[in-house]
């Protein structure tokens, strides 16, 4: 059974993934982001369900073309390094997940923008977090 | 003195169509973002559309996508909104607003026109 | 889209007491510049909104001292240390870290 440190320690986990992607849709999701246009046009796999943190499979195998598309959003509004940003969410993603067991994820037949996509995973944190608490 | 000045407001039956003009003076217009801003009757503020200080990006609410189109004529400091298949919800007073996006400051919407009456009725 | 609310809806208030009006967002609003783009407006019956706070705490030129703005994330607070006749009116948040939104709006009203 979990311990109270260990569900404290997976709280902070999902907090800080949880500022990292809320800190990218900003950076990417506003009009003064000359790039927003192109960025839409690139498609994202959903999760066909996302209620556990064994899902969490599905962000981590989309993390290198979400890492290619935060590549062209180099400007005055987005400051974040791409490479360092999602080496962090790597870390967080493979601490929370677990090596373990191994998850084949399954994929939603619709693909999404990387807005979408953001806010999917942005609730299901936010989803986790308010069970742990 | 910096200044905002709407017109083209009016009465309009449902479906019909209207263009809002936004006059800018004391300023460098074509430095400065635009945005439409719109409040009906006794609500809230909603944002409508921004275009970019070049005219090079354009992006709207939801709300008024594919029916209303923002643009802007730096050569004669002008913003106009270009309102088709209008309904009874877009009655309203429009204004106009300015941001500087790549300034020092980032004050957002720092100056606000006057508005201008937009109402949609049979 | 980012929903702002705001508390309380109405405040009376009397003349040379504080007010408070509390503004909550639905996601955290720091950019990554690193900024926090919440601003307060306030409109005057018959008027246009006016600019009063930028970047949750800056004061735009011309506002009086009497009002200050604090918070941080997604909870952020207006106050008027003293309120003045001319205060009476609606004031809205706002936040342009993504597409802008605002707040449904706080009337204030003297007793």
């Known amino acids: 059974a979990p311990t109270s440190s260990s569900t404290k320690k997976t709280q902070l986990q999902l907090e800080h993934l949880l500022l990292d992607l809320q800190m990218i849709l900003n950076g990417i999701n506003n009009y003064k982001n000359p790039k927003l246009t192109r960025m839409l046009t690139f498609k994202f796999y959903m999760p066909k369900k996302a209620t556990e943190l064994k899902h969490l499979q599905c962000l981590e195998e989309e993390l290198k073309p979400l890492e290619e598309v935060l590549n062209l959003a180099q400007s005055k509004n987005f400051h974040l390094r791409p490479r360092d940003l999602i080496s962090n969410i790597n870390v967080i993603v493979l601490e929370l997940k677990g090596s373990e067991t191994t998850f084949m994820c399954e994929y939603a037949d619709e693909t999404a923008t990387i807005v979408e996509f953001l806010n999917r995973w942005i609730t299901f944190c936010q989803s986790i977090i308010s069970t742990l608490t | 003195q910096v200044q905002l000045v709407e017109s083209g407001g009016g009465v309009v039956q449902p479906g019909r169509s209207l263009r809002l003009s936004c006059a800018a003076s004391?300023?460098?217009?074509?430095?400065?973002?635009m945005h439409w801003v719109r409040q009906a009757p006794g609500k809230g503020l909603e944002w409508v559309a921004v275009i970019w200080y070049d005219g090079s990006n354009e992006y709207y609410a939801d709300s008024v996508k594919g029916r209303f189109t923002i643009s802007r004529d730096n050569s004669k400091n002008t913003l106009y909104l270009q309102m088709h298949s209008l309904r009874a919800e877009d009655t309203a007073v429009y204004y106009c607003a300015r941001e500087e996006w790549f300034g020092e400051a980032d004050y957002g919407m720092d100056v606000w026109g006057q508005g201008t009456t937009v109402t949609v009725s049979s | 889209d980012i929903v702002m609310t705001q508390t309380p809806l109405s405040s009376p208030v009397t003349l040379g007491q504080p007010a408070s009006i509390s503004c909550r967002s639905s996601?955290?609003?720091?950019?990554?510049?690193?900024?926090?783009?919440l601003s307060w407006l306030h409109q005057r019956p018959g008027q246009p909104p006016r600019l009063l706070i930028y970047k949750i705490s800056n004061r735009f030129s011309g506002v009086p001292d009497r009002f200050s703005g604090s918070g941080a994330g997604t909870d952020f607070t207006l106050k008027i240390s003293r309120v003045e006749a001319e205060d009476v009116g609606v004031y809205f948040c706002?936040?342009?870290?993504?597409?802008?939104?605002f707040g449904q709006g706080t009337k204030v009203e003297i007793k």
């Open positions: 004391g300023f460098t217009f074509s430095s400065y973002g």
């Open positions: 996601q955290n609003l720091v950019q990554s510049d690193g900024n926090t783009y």
């Open positions: 706002m936040q342009t870290t993504q597409f802008p939104t």
